[in-house]
Interface confidence: low
Amino acid sequence: GLECDGRTNLCCRQQFFIDFRLIGWNDWIIAPTGYYGNYCEGSCPAYLAGVPGSASSFHTAVVNQYRMRGLNPGTVNSCCIPTKLSTMSMLYFDDEYNIVKRDVPNMIVEECGCA
Amino acid sequence: GLECDGRTNLCCRQQFFIDFRLIGWNDWIIAPTGYYGNYCEGSCPAYLAGVPGSASSFHTAVVNQYRMRGLNPGTVNSCCIPTKLSTMSMLYFDDEYNIVKRDVPNMIVEECGCA
């Protein structure tokens, strides 16, 4: 997946620091105080659909074939979304105010692609 | 997930028949000749992000919190994409022209959501 470097408007991964204080989650998340969660942005022209490939690979390939022939079904758009996410360790209060340490999945966007 | 019924512009599942002849895949796919693969379309306002929930749930929730506070990181958009796909059985020629019957995953869009 591409890294956003200011030189492309294609689907890419933008580094982004998520500050838990800014969204009021510091009252239950103990650590970390924030982290690079990143996000996906950019355009998805037809030739990029399904690259690097989301979970919906066969379906994406079919819709892509329609697109390439100018046969777009309705207003379906190709979307720049996370295609690879990773886990991060977090220390937080659960509903009963116990301190819990857990590896939380899908916290960090590692790669982006067109779905 | 919502079904597109012409009364909403929110993220929904649009029924769509995929005709393999139309995209030139009838030369290798024996059966079926086509199928309802469907697709996702519609808008994803902030309050819908992560509903019914894509795989990136924690990350989606965080970005949604930013959105709801008017703190959109850059130009990140919420996207109407398949959140549940299903398998379908297909009969086709493989690379060596053997006839193969296989359950192909991710062929049919069952539900859509905002990621």
């Epitope: 982004f16 620091f17 500050d19 204080r21 800014l22 103990i30 650590a31 970390p32 105080t33 924030g34 982290y35 690079y36 360790s89 220390l91 340490k101 | 930013y66 703190l71 959109n72 990181p73 850059g74």
Partner: antibody, heavy 116, light 107 residues
């Protein structure tokens, strides 16, 4: 490309207030949510984290300095400010601002000497 | 506050040798640890973040390992430009704290 630059007077008298500015270029503070850390380094010594501020003005200060430190932000000027009052010779240091998160982008630093 | 202790204070090695620097936290910081290199008159430069990830543009001879309380920065084969002071930083909890530094000098 994100760049940070510290500026301020090089010499401050004891008991006065040290005022520094960190000017950010490469992303607008009004739309980005990237904060900065202030870090200092006394001559010949190690690094000390002073605190953090984000574009909304939320701050976290090092408890050892909290009573004397104030941080602020002016998004229209793309600037963060640091003030340390009642300075002594122990506040003589190179002062850095660095991008939030694990600090990956640093300014070059500005030297502040506290002396009469 | 979390106290970060680096050892040794000074490491005397020759170019081409392997350098192993240690950083210990007074309590667990998970993998929220970074390593910096600093040369005289310059700002620190990020080498490693999240304990093991090399920052952009950092040569492969630099590697980080560890989690919890014990961390290591390894320079597989010292180049002349690697002689500098190295700091670790924990960023799991405020206040963020740096180690006291390890000076890698030419033997």
């Amino acid at each position: 490309q994100v760049q940070l630059q510290e500026s301020g007077p090089g010499l401050v008298k004891p008991s006065q207030t040290l005022s520094l500015t960190c000017t950010v270029s490469g992303f607008p503070l009004s739309t980005s949510r990237m904060g900065v850390n202030w870090i200092r380094q006394p001559p010949g010594k190690g690094l000390e984290w002073i605190g953090y501020i984000n574009p909304s003005g939320a701050t976290d200060y090092n408890p050892s300095l909290k009573s004397r430190v104030t941080m602020s932000v002016d998004t229209s000027k793309n600037q963060f400010s640091l003030k340390v009052n009642s300075v002594t010779a122990a506040d003589t240091a190179v002062y850095y601002c660095a991008r939030a998160g694990y600090p990956d982008v640093w300014g070059k630093g500005t030297t502040v000497t506290v002396s009469s | 506050e979390i106290v970060m202790t680096q050892s040794p204070a000074t490491l005397s090695l020759s170019p081409g040798e392997r350098a192993t620097l240690s950083c210990r936290a007074s309590q667990s910081v998970s993998t929220h640890l970074a390593w910096y290199q600093q040369k005289p008159g310059q700002a620190p430069r990020l080498l490693i973040y999240d304990a093991t990830n090399r920052a952009t543009g950092i040569p492969a001879r630099f590697s980080g390992s560890g989690s919890g309380t014990d961390f290591t920065l390894t320079i597989s084969s010292l180049e002349p430009e690697d002689f500098a002071v190295y700091y670790c930083l924990q960023y799991t909890n405020y206040p963020w704290t740096f180690g006291g530094g390890t000076k890698v000098e030419i033997k």
